[in-house]
Interface confidence: medium
């Protein structure tokens, strides 16, 4: 069956300077290919965080993602500014062999509202 | 305080349409999901559609798609449910449901209305 | 879709008797996990959410646990305004939302 990724939470709200986590879970690794996280859609969605390996400021992983049979790809993203406020997406992608990666599925999104402290 | 008045239902026969709304109150209407949750004679819940408060976001439950369509009107903070060929199965009380605005569970229900599709 | 069933159907008791209702998910849904309370000719009541949670102004007689596919809902000595049918409802999943079939909690 068709991977599935989920995102619980509709909406999270985090004040200014505060650390937030975002929960995505997926039914299956497969097909072989990276979860990444994006902020927006469309021509303005911005790269968030990859579990691939690179290092993003402010943001790491909840759980042990090289643990065998890991499914949480959950993110925490911490010291949060008004400028990280927006929807958030969870994105699952099939490799490619030369070509770019495909994306296949991603969550239903989670928006970050950002309060003054 | 919150409130939901559904209205609209009635005897209708297998095939025809109602149009069912909800009028909300004692809340900002267009910063929440709203659903329609419907509940046959005797049995339990069965969740039918959801709309975002944009009203971008629109799901239905396989036993309604192509026949239900929900809308909304955030100018006059009601909701709407355009119920097409309509079926003996159908036959429920029909609630509108207000979402927490951080999870898809529900914190207030109307009183329901009653739609009974016979011939 | 995830499937959500709930035991015993009917559950006869007394007041005062403790109540200890079951729902069980198809697959986790973590602790994503409400509970309502129907009486006749009414709508539904939010009871519990987040598995644990209790909705506002809801007794503390009732109580919620468990996480992933076990659920229960427990009230700790019944009164006469508990006596209803209580369904669970998952919201882990996008939709479609779904609920349990019920417990119908009647006197002894």
């Known amino acids: 069956t068709e991977v599935k990724v989920t995102q619980p939470e509709k909406s999270v709200s985090v004040a200014a300077g505060d650390s937030t986590i975002l929960n995505c879970t997926v039914t299956s690794l497969l097909p072989v290919g990276p979860i990444r996280w994006y902020r927006g859609v469309g021509q303005s969605r911005l790269l968030i965080y990859s579990f691939t390996g690179e290092h993003f400021p402010r943001i790491r992983n909840v759980s042990d993602t090289t643990k065998r049979n890991n499914m949480d790809f959950s993110i925490r993203i911490s010291n949060v500014t008004p400028e990280d406020a927006g929807t958030y997406y969870c994105v699952k992608f099939q490799r490619g062999s030369s070509e770019p990666d495909t994306e296949i599925q991603s969550g239903g999104g989670t928006e970050v509202y950002v309060l003054a402290k | 305080e919150v409130q939901l008045v559904e209205s609209g239902g009635g005897v209708v026969q297998p095939g025809r349409s109602l149009r069912l709304s909800c009028a909300a109150s004692g809340f900002t209407f267009s910063s929440y999901d709203v659903n329609w949750v419907r509940q046959a004679p005797g049995k339990g819940l069965e969740w039918v559609s959801l709309?975002?408060?944009?009203?971008?976001?629109?799901y239905y439950a396989d036993s309604v798609k192509g026949r239900f369509t929900i809308s909304r009107d955030n100018s006059k903070n009601t909701l709407y449910l355009q119920m097409n060929s309509l079926r003996a199965e159908d036959t429920a009380v029909y609630y509108c449901?207000?979402?927490?605005?951080?999870?898809?569970?529900?914190?207030?229900w109307g009183q329901g209305t009653l739609v009974t599709v016979s011939s | 879709e995830i499937v959500l069933t709930q035991s015993p159907g009917t559950l006869t008791l007394s007041p005062g008797e403790r109540a200890t209702l079951s729902c069980r998910a198809s697959q986790s849904v973590y602790t994503y996990l409400a509970w309502y309370q129907q009486k006749p000719g009414q709508a539904p009541r939010l009871l519990i959410y987040g598995a644990s949670s209790r909705a506002t102004g809801i007794p503390d007689r009732f109580s919620g646990s468990g996480s992933g596919t076990e659920f229960t809902l427990t009230i700790s000595s019944l009164q006469s305004e508990d006596f209803a049918v209580y369904y669970c409802q998952q919201y882990y999943d996008r939709p479609p939302l779904t609920f349990g079939g019920g417990t119908k909690v009647e006197i002894k």
């Open positions: 449901a207000k979402e927490n605005n951080r999870y898809r569970f529900f914190d207030d």
């Open positions: 709309i975002s408060g944009s009203g971008e976001i629109i």
